[in-house]
Amino acid sequence: EVEKTACPSGKKAPEIDESLIFYKKWELEACVDAALLATQMDRVNAIPFTYEQLDVLKHKLDELYPQGYPESVIQHLGYLFLKMSPEDIRKWNVTSLETLKALLEVNKGHEMSPQVATLIDRFVKGRGQLDKDTLDTLTAFYPGYLCSLSPEELSSVPPSSIWAVRPQDLDTCDPRQLDVLYPKARLAFQNMNGSEYFVKIQSFLGGAPTEDLKALSQQNVSMDLATFMKLRTDAVLPLTVAEVQKLLGPHVEGLKAEERHRPVRDWILRQRQDDLDTLGLGLQG
């Protein structure tokens, strides 16, 4: 807490500008009017304040807005955002996607901090659902964001938002998450033709049931082994040798290299040796 001291003569700040970087902490506290700071927040990011000086500016804003900052101030916090605690952020009502983007930009390139997690949580809860524009923004800054959500949280994602998801956004999702996302993706992409549909649905197939895999096997999709290895074991087991051959197309030869790994291993054990031999890969059931 900075002690209350009178502002020295001639040092009262008429505006927020670069001259303030030469002010000591106590001078900033005494000579910068909090209301002026709030109205000129957009200037703060353009001035090379130190972390210590930012602490003082935050203190001034906290005094002016004990119930939480208005969005007009939040949008221009810039590096001051790094000084906020999750408790501070819980007092905010952030509704503008532009505000969210501005704050995420401050943390760009760094791990998702508790502050950012709290901000995102507040924003999404305020919107009621994870709409496409929000998801677009969040995955642009944090490709792993979607997979950090629980299956319950993912259930609030509308199918229309799935269009914003890129394959890399699903890299760290586990099967329980893909179980929730797959039906939404199936719904979102249902009006696409075969080959285009497969390109879009491919990264969600870790949540696909057997009947959908059977249907895909009839469409000459040529699934690669990397995708096949991510399929649910329980969904793969009922597939026949002929269905797997059609599903993988020219990639079927890759089964040999994966014969000791799930789900290939478990699938092989379920098949008749005569059927496996038709593949000519030397797979032993």
């Epitope: 970087i21 990011n45 353009a46 001035i47 090379p48 304040f49 130190t50 972390y51 210590e52 930012l54 810039g78 590096y79 790094l82 930009e105 401050v106 760009k108 390139g109 760094h110």
Partner: nanobody, 122 residues
């Protein structure tokens, strides 16, 4: 691992010019504000110039204003310091540094290069 590598230092006559370069990793460059500092023998490290990651704002120490120019090339993940009208008092080891914020204080910069010597003879 964060690496900042300076180059371009050397011996130059008063009134001459030099351009220092500082190459950074893509991740560091895109998530940091970059600054140049210098340290003359027996003196404290001194702020020279900084460029803000957000908005691209630039700030110079009064001692170099109008003579030095900081710039960056995003495609090359490199920040430059173009120094002209050099004076003997500009002689120092010049350091490039990166910070999460746009600051004029060396304390706020987390990563530093090894430095490059600039000597200005009269």
């Amino acid at each position: 691992e964060v690496q900042l590598v300076e180059s371009g230092g050397g011996l130059v006559q008063a009134g001459g010019a030099l351009r220092l370069s500082c190459a950074a990793s893509e991740r560091t460059f895109s998530s940091s504000s970059m600054g140049w500092f210098r340290q003359a023998p027996g003196k404290e490290r001194e702020f020279v110039a900084a460029i803000n990651r957000i908005g691209g704002h630039i700030y110079y120490a009064d001692s170099v204003k109008g003579r030095f120019t900081i710039s960056k090339d995003n495609a090359k993940n490199t920040v430059y310091l173009q120094m002209s009208s050099l004076k003997p008092e500009d002689t120092a080891v010049y350091y490039c540094a990166s910070s999460r914020i746009y600051s004029h204080s060396a304390r706020d910069y987390d990563y530093w290069g090894q430095g490059t010597q600039v000597t200005v003879s009269s």
